[in-house]
């Protein structure tokens, strides 16, 4: 019960922090530009991975795509190659993990299965999380290297009056949105992973072992027990109290002549 | 620190055409139009031409240079042009580019200048 509360919740935790981070991404709100020292301020301008918006003091606000004219820094599009990996990945963590999901059952899929599948979706999660994490603190970074503090003399309109304002770009809020989205979706990484190890058949468990008499075809099933006999010989590496007892897959698979009790 | 660069500026003759190029050291983030702004002696620093990420559809000029001046952009070349042609002794002054914010009605400059190039009109 535990393992699929585990489960569910790593989902559900990974869920949210992947629409955080599609979210994020598709925000203009990376970089804000805040002005002062102004009587009359005449814009207010932000930015995006994808484009700049300008909000005039009359509330006219218009968005526009990047001016590539100059080209666009090799920063920015590490980031946003940073943050469409982390949805990629997040995205296809998502679909193995509603088939890895405990309470969803799909035809006749083992536990192992499950528990590879689990594992798979976490590492996912974890690796999304930690590309979303990466991409908002290198434009972080950028702007606070790049842009901090930086003064601006401001001419509004054709032919317009020198109108002079000190600029200072600040973090938008898609940052914090990232950072928690990423840190989300590592989260849930981790808690699926977690889960995997509740979900995994362990080695000690109790298999159903085929036993073969010489001469006979008859294969008898212990009730789920595991019997060691000390005989047989131990050339796969098995451990010895394996003995010579197979389950019924390594029967099919592995015929021997030498299984006798 | 990315640097714009004018050059083109001269002296000429009324009547006459030039052509101003702005180039840079380096891409610009967050930037969505290029300006050009004249400063007259004696007079404040304005806006002429300006050019938005729409392309060359996409551009505003003062009224004073309308239909004479025109903003283009070489995206191979990474240039901003502005070919002024009918050149008037008015239009002497010191040309800046500008790399900053266009919308519909209007363009804002960002924090990036060239460093001018001086433009002579005799008459």
């Known amino acids: 019960m535990a393992v699929t509360a585990c489960q569910g919740l790593g989902f559900v935790v990974s869920l949210i922090g992947i629409a955080g981070i599609i979210a994020a991404t598709c925000m203009d709100q990376w970089s804000t530009q805040d002005l002062y020292n102004n009587p009359v301020t005449a814009v207010f301008n932000y930015q995006g991975l994808w484009r700049s918006c300008v909000r005039e003091s009359s509330g006219f606000t218009e968005c526009r795509g990047y001016f590539t004219l100059l080209g666009l820094p090799a920063m920015l599009q590490a980031v946003r190659a940073l943050m469409i990996v982390g949805i990629v990945l997040g995205a296809i963590g998502l679909l193995v993990s509603i088939f890895a999901l405990k309470c969803i059952r799909i035809g006749s899929m083992e536990d192992s299965a499950k528990a590879n599948m689990t594992l798979t979706s976490g590492i996912m999660f974890i690796v999304s999380g930690l590309c979303a994490i990466a991409g908002v603190s290198v434009f972080a970074n950028m702007l606070v290297t790049n842009f901090w503090m930086s003064t601006a003399n401001m001419y509004t309109g054709m032919g317009g009056m020198v109108q002079t304002v000190q600029t200072r770009y600040t973090f938008g809020a898609a940052l914090f949105v990232g950072w928690v989205a990423g840190g989300l979706t590592l989260i849930g990484g981790v808690m699926m992973c977690i889960a995997c190890r509740g979900l995994a058949p362990e080695e000690t468990n109790y298999k159903a072992v085929s036993y073969h008499a010489s001469g006979h075809s008859v294969a008898y099933k212990p009730g789920g027990f595991k019997a060691s006999t000390g005989f047989g010989s131990n050339t796969k590496n098995k451990k010895i109290y394996d003995g010579g007892a197979r389950t019924e897959d390594e029967v099919q698979s592995y015929p021997s002549k030498h299984d006798y009790v | 620190q990315v640097q714009l660069v004018e050059s083109g500026g001269q002296s000429a003759q009324a009547g006459g055409s030039l052509r101003l190029s702005c180039t840079a050291s380096?891409?610009?983030?967050?930037?969505?139009?290029m300006g050009w702004y004249r400063q007259a002696p004696g007079k404040e620093r304005e806006l002429i031409a300006a050019?938005?990420?729409?392309?060359?559809?996409?551009?505003k000029y003062a009224e004073s240079v309308k239909g004479r001046f025109t903003i283009s952009g070489d995206y191979a070349k990474k240039t901003l042009y502005l070919q002024m042609n009918s050149l008037k002794p008015e239009d002497s002054g010191v040309y800046y580019c500008?790399?900053?914010?266009?919308?519909?009605?209007?363009?804002?400059?960002?924090?990036?200048w060239g460093q001018g190039t001086q433009v002579t009109v005799a008459a």
């Open positions: 380096g891409s610009i983030f967050g930037i969505s139009g």
């Open positions: 050019i938005g990420s729409g392309g060359d559809g996409d551009t």
């Open positions: 500008n790399a900053g914010f266009m919308t519909s009605r209007n363009y804002y400059n960002g924090d990036y």
